[in-house]
Amino acid sequence: RPSFSLVEDTTLEPEEPPTKYQISQPEVYVAAPGESLEVRCLLKDAAVISWTKDGVHLGPNNRTVLIGEYLQIKGATPRDSGLYACTASRTVDSETWYFMVNVTDAISSGDDEDDTDGAEDFVSENSNNKRAPYWTNTEKMEKRLHAVPAANTVKFRCPAGGNPMPTMRWLKNGKEFKQEHRIGGYKVRNQHWSLIMESVVPSDKGNYTCVVENEYGSINHTYHLDVVERSPHRPILQAGLPANASTVVGGDVEFVCKVYSDAQPHIQWIKHVEKNGSKYGPDGLPYLKVLKHSGINSSNAEVLALFNVTEADAGEYICKVSNYIGQANQSAWLTVLPKQQAPGREKEITASPDYLE
């Protein structure tokens, strides 16, 4: 049974899916495989802290140490990547802080900046000295295993020389790598001896071999790409938003809710209201009114704008976001001051009603 009563039966229109959902990201902690990682739960006044990873309880084990407000992961592996949360339980409420962990090797086999001056990789030979292909910069090829988070860009490099200048081609899992083998294709920068794949997906996992050859010989080098996956998760709301606000009667005010969601988010702005002089229904649940929601006829649903406010507009405003996996809610208070008082932006505190997280 829902823990609120809607004041009116609002029929929600079908949503128009946006082209992208990411509006803001939770904080990301990056570690290389084998490294240790320590994260402090950024919540105050916690009596008890509990930890989860991708929604599942996280307990101590031989690699995971939980001490007070600290989480330590020893000898991190790509499997440690995911969406983490710490929940601070207090006597009257609880609060959750989300963060991402990416355990990943460097994104490319050579720094991206190299592309601006690839001349050092392009070795010119005296035309008389015929020479089979050879590697010119083995340091950039040392890292063979690349564990990369999904949606990142990957660059593999095989800087080579030879005379005549060798040609380069790429194989995936031992077979010719064709543009149609992946959505969006790939780029080959012959000048930089590089293969670039943007926005990698799990199906990009595999062995990538550069074959560098001329009429005097052939050399090859293989990289292994692992795309680190993450389970889908419910929406995440940026901490501190919406922020408490105050304005004078007749003034305008804006509440903002920043959302990060893997899947289509449905955003609702809800306010506690009174009906027949009461804030609660016969069942003891608060009366709520949907002020705005994402949909075809709704402009930027992450922003709730109130114009020419009256004292009746004062109160708590809830940003509620849901996707097929679950929900997230945060709220803020609006204080409406008499005209003679100057308004000021209050400290950004999120207040949550009982039934919210």
Partner: antibody
Framework: QVQLVQSGAEVKKPGSSVKVSCKAS????????VHWVRQAPGQGLEWIGS????????TYDEDYRGRATITADKSTSTAYMELSSLRSEDTAVYYC???????WGQGTLVTVSS | DIQMTQSPSSLSASVGDRVTITCKGS??????IAWYQQKPGKAPKLLIY???YRYSGVPSRFSGSGSGTDFTFTISSLQPEDIATYYC?????????FGQGTKLEIK
């Protein structure tokens, strides 16, 4: 590990109601929707509705609105789906699934027969 | 409601074959589509979510692609254990509709 365990098979008369339970374990029950999906014999999958256990928000396919009631008990990490005014065409296997559809119950066969 | 039209409804292929199933949405759903495998008497099993993301533990021969209204599910090299019925599902807006299913058999 994550598990969803459903109640046993039911045989019901037309016009009656059935209530199927789904007990969750291995994850934070209040952090994920619970979906209900049904499959008639030899047919495809059909989404009935879902609930967010933390606040009881539920949503339904229009075909089931008013006839299906999805509830959740946070204290026992159990979701329920009650279907009323049963007819023979409601004979199906009813599944519960976690919000991300990565974990499903074993299914509950409901047979409606006079 | 968003209708998901899946094709073919059944197909027969040999071990080692590349198998492709398509799903078309009546409305744009960005990349909010999942693919499931269901074997007789068992619950569906999530293979792909968000159009192209393979779920943990799913073999690499299974892949998905597409965006908007047109989506493709591929088994790169069919194995005997892949015999099952496959479903697409949009998880963009409620109701979260499924395709009609594709029954895959071995030749």
């Amino acid at each position: 590990q994550v598990q969803l365990v459903q109640s046993g098979a039911e045989v019901k008369k037309p016009g009656s109601s059935v209530k199927v339970s789904c007990k969750a374990s291995g994850y934070i029950f209040t952090s994920y929707n619970v979906h209900w999906v049904r499959q008639a014999p030899g047919q495809g999958l059909e989404w009935i509705g879902s609930i967010y256990p933390d606040n009881g928000d539920s949503t339904y396919d229009e075909d089931y609105r008013g006839r299906a009631t999805i509830t959740a008990d946070k204290s026992t990490s159990t979701a329920y789906m009650e279907l009323s005014s049963l007819r023979s065409e409601d004979t199906a296997v009813y599944y519960c699934a976690r919000g991300d559809f990565a974990y499903w119950g074993q299914g509950t066969l409901v047979t409606v027969s006079s | 409601d968003i209708q998901m039209t899946q094709s073919p409804s059944s197909l027969s292929a040999s071990v080692g074959d590349r198998v492709t199933i398509t799903c078309k949405g009546s409305n744009g759903i960005s990349n909010d589509i999942a693919w499931y495998q269901q074997k007789p008497g068992k619950a569906p099993k999530l293979l792909i979510y968000s159009a192209s993301y393979r779920y943990s533990g799913v073999p690499s021969r299974f892949s998905g692609s597409g965006s908007g209204t047109d989506f493709t599910f591929t088994i790169s090299s069919l194995q005997p254990e892949d015999i099952a019925t496959y479903y697409c599902q949009q998880h963009s807006t409620t109701p979260y509709t499924f395709g009609q299913g594709t029954k895959l058999e071995i030749k």
